[in-house]
Interface confidence: medium
């Protein structure tokens, strides 16, 4: 199967690596701009230089390109608890992350929020907290895991998944049936 190529990829594939087809003259291959720069003017002819200009403050290009504009630098989302790991430069976007003892929870592919790593109170650390994953806890006897916290079996109602873990205690628990809600 031949992969589907967009118009720009088709045009680029005719030229050797590091060059692109002049948009007005498909017999000319112009040299792409280095990262940190953008295309100001196409090369006037074969073997002549492409006019590339450095990205302005607040913008970047991270790879060789023939973009007419640099990309805007990302801003770390303070309301998501994000902190700036490294500032934006002309050739690299801002890098955002979380503070120490926090992990990234990705709500969607490009959106993450920082949460505190679980401390596994009333349990032990099974897997340590990682950059993109909370601590995995194992609970002590008399406790069950709910939303990665060790909760006393006295909070276990008969219809919940905790019943197996809290089997010896469950008979003493008073509470109404609770169809899967927690």
């Amino acid at each position: 199967l031949v992969p589907h190529l967009g118009d720009r990829e088709k045009r680029d594939s005719v030229c050797p690596q590091g060059k692109y087809i002049h948009p007005q003259n498909n017999s000319i291959c112009c040299t792409k701009c280095h990262k940190g720069t953008y295309l100001y003017n196409d090369c006037p002819g074969p073997g002549q230089d492409t006019d590339c200009r450095e990205c302005e403050s607040g913008s970047f290009t991270a790879s060789e390109n023939h973009l007419r504009h640099c990309l805007s630098c990302s801003k770390c989302r303070k309301e998501m608890g994000q902190v700036e790991i490294s500032s934006c430069t002309v050739d690299r976007d801002t890098v955002c992350g979380c503070r120490k003892n926090q992990y990234r929870h990705y709500w969607s592919e490009n959106l993450f929020q920082c949460f505190n790593c679980s401390l596994c109170l009333n349990g032990t650390v099974h897997l340590s907290c990682q950059e993109k994953q909370n601590t995995v806890c194992t609970c002590h006897a008399g406790f069950f895991l709910r939303e990665n916290e060790c909760v006393s079996c006295s909070n276990c109602k008969k219809s919940l998944e905790c019943t197996k873990l809290c089997l010896p205690q469950i008979e003493n628990v008073k509470g109404t049936e609770d169809s899967g809600t927690t």
Partner: nanobody
């Protein structure tokens, strides 16, 4: 094209009620778990409630437990959030979201979101 369209938000007094709806299209609604998430002004996202494909299992954040009820009508491709005993701290933009998978996961990841509906609780 997947679309999620929330409605039902508005201004309500403390102690009042609202029912949010989320009309889904562009995917087989009955095949996916759904979630309500909210974002208070200037704050991060907060997971509110989750419901499985068939509407049998539901989960709630502690902050809304006993006051909010999530439900779905697969014949109408619609997700609901009944909000009672509303408090000032419930003021937020409420989003419905489609889960990536059918796995039971709290704080899961979403591949599609609605545009949100604003709920303001104020006297």
């Amino acid at each position: 094209e997947v679309q999620l369209l929330e409605s039902g938000g508005g201004l309500v007094q403390p102690g009042g009620s609202l029912r949010l709806s989320c009309a889904a299209s562009g995917f087989t609604f009955a095949d996916y778990n759904m979630t309500w998430v909210r974002q208070a002004p200037g704050k991060g996202l907060e997971w509110v409630s989750w419901i499985d494909q068939e509407g049998v299992f539901t989960y709630y954040a502690d902050s809304v437990k006993g006051r909010f009820t999530i439900s779905r009508d697969n014949s109408k491709n619609t997700l609901y959030l009944q909000m009672n005993s509303l408090r000032a701290e419930d003021t937020a933009v409420y989003y419905c979201a489609k889960d990536f998978s059918a796995a039971v996961m709290l704080r899961t990841s979403f591949d599609y979101w609605g545009q949100g509906t604003l709920v303001t609780v104020s006297s």
